[in-house]
């Protein structure tokens, strides 16, 4: 289990407890409710695909 306050993830990634691995912050526009997005520096700008249902 990931210790609080530590991150094994490279820049641009954040730890996902749900998926038990580092995940790319770039995926947060498409999956904004993912647990790891809370660990990304800022909410990245949306891209077009967010407009799809």
């Amino acid at each position: 289990e990931q210790a609080p306050g530590t991150s094994p993830c490279s820049s641009g990634s954040s730890w996902s407890a749900d998926l038990d691995k580092c995940m790319d912050c770039a995926s947060c526009p498409a999956r904004p409710h993912s647990d790891f997005c809370l660990g990304c520096a800022a909410a990245p700008p949306a891209h077009f695909r967010l407009l799809w249902p």
Partner: antibody, heavy 119, light 111 residues
Framework: EVKLGESGGGLVQPGGSMKLSCVAS????????MNWVRQSPEKGLEWVAE??????????HYAESAKGRFTISRDDSRSSVYLQMNNLRAEDTAIYYC??????????WGQGTSVTVSS | DIVLTQSPASLAVSLGQRATISCKAS??????????MQWYQQRPGQSPKLLIK???KLDSGVPARFSGSGSGTDFTLNIHPVEEEDTATYYC?????????FGGGTRLEIK
């Protein structure tokens, strides 16, 4: 280890139907969108359909070439995704792959199942 | 739909040298933060395999001799130094919008 096993391909006549299946293991299936992608010498790699999560009400999206003819579905209890293909045409002849994506990347690919539409 | 044009269609590179493959998109697939472009490798007789995501990030287990760069509409895959096992067809793919589309592929032969 991630495993994806496609099945259900074969030879079918134009206008016929076929249902492809893909059984997945080695990753949290319920958290991943699932895609079908096909590959033919004529058209190369071509995305066909995507199905999202239960929390997205299993939203589906299709390529124009698949709309109205193909239906993607999933069974989370079986870690499986399906592609029902109706009114098949010669141009649907291809190898069909299933692939999970968390958001943008097709992280893993199965070995594919071959579909031939010919009389 | 976004059209991805790869060049060259094929290339032959001597062992240990550099291979450079281009992918041009018909419209931008980048925000100020990220580029939504991926690269895949397909060895003969095998399924595609993810190499690079978000234009420049290597997938886990991919050797460091692979690198990706670019933003907006112009993207590049570099392999240096090339090895025998790099003989394959390489595809770019965008995830900016639906439908996802792929480039036509670049076949790499090692001399």
């Amino acid at each position: 280890e991630v495993k994806l096993g496609e099945s259900g391909g074969g030879l079918v006549q134009p206008g016929g139907s076929m249902k492809l299946s893909c059984v997945a293991s080695g990753f949290p299936f319920t958290k991943y969108w699932m895609n079908w992608v096909r590959q033919s010498p004529e058209k190369g790699l071509e995305w066909v359909a995507e199905i999202r999560l239960k929390s997205d009400n299993y939203a589906t999206h299709y390529a124009e070439s698949a709309k109205g003819r193909f239906t993607i579905s999933r069974d989370d209890s079986r870690s499986s995704v399906y592609l029902q293909m109706n009114n098949l045409r010669a141009e649907d002849t291809a190898i069909y792959y299933c692939s999970p994506t968390y958001a943008d990347t097709m992280d893993y690919w199965g070995q594919g199942t071959s579909v031939t539409v010919s009389s | 739909d976004i059209v991805l044009t790869q060049s060259p269609a094929s290339l032959a590179v001597s062992l240990g040298q550099r291979a450079t493959i281009s992918c041009k998109a018909s419209q931008s697939v980048s925000t100020s933060t990220y580029s939504y472009m991926q690269w895949y490798q397909q060895r003969p007789g095998q399924s595609p395999k993810l190499l690079i995501k978000y234009a420049s990030k290597l997938d886990s287990g991919v050797p460091a001799r692979f690198s990706g760069s670019g933003s907006g509409t112009d993207f590049t895959l570099n392999i240096h130094p090339v090895e025998e096992e790099d003989t394959a067809t390489y595809y770019c793919q965008h995830s900016w919008e639906l439908p996802y589309t792929f480039g036509g592929g670049t076949r790499l032969e090692i001399k």
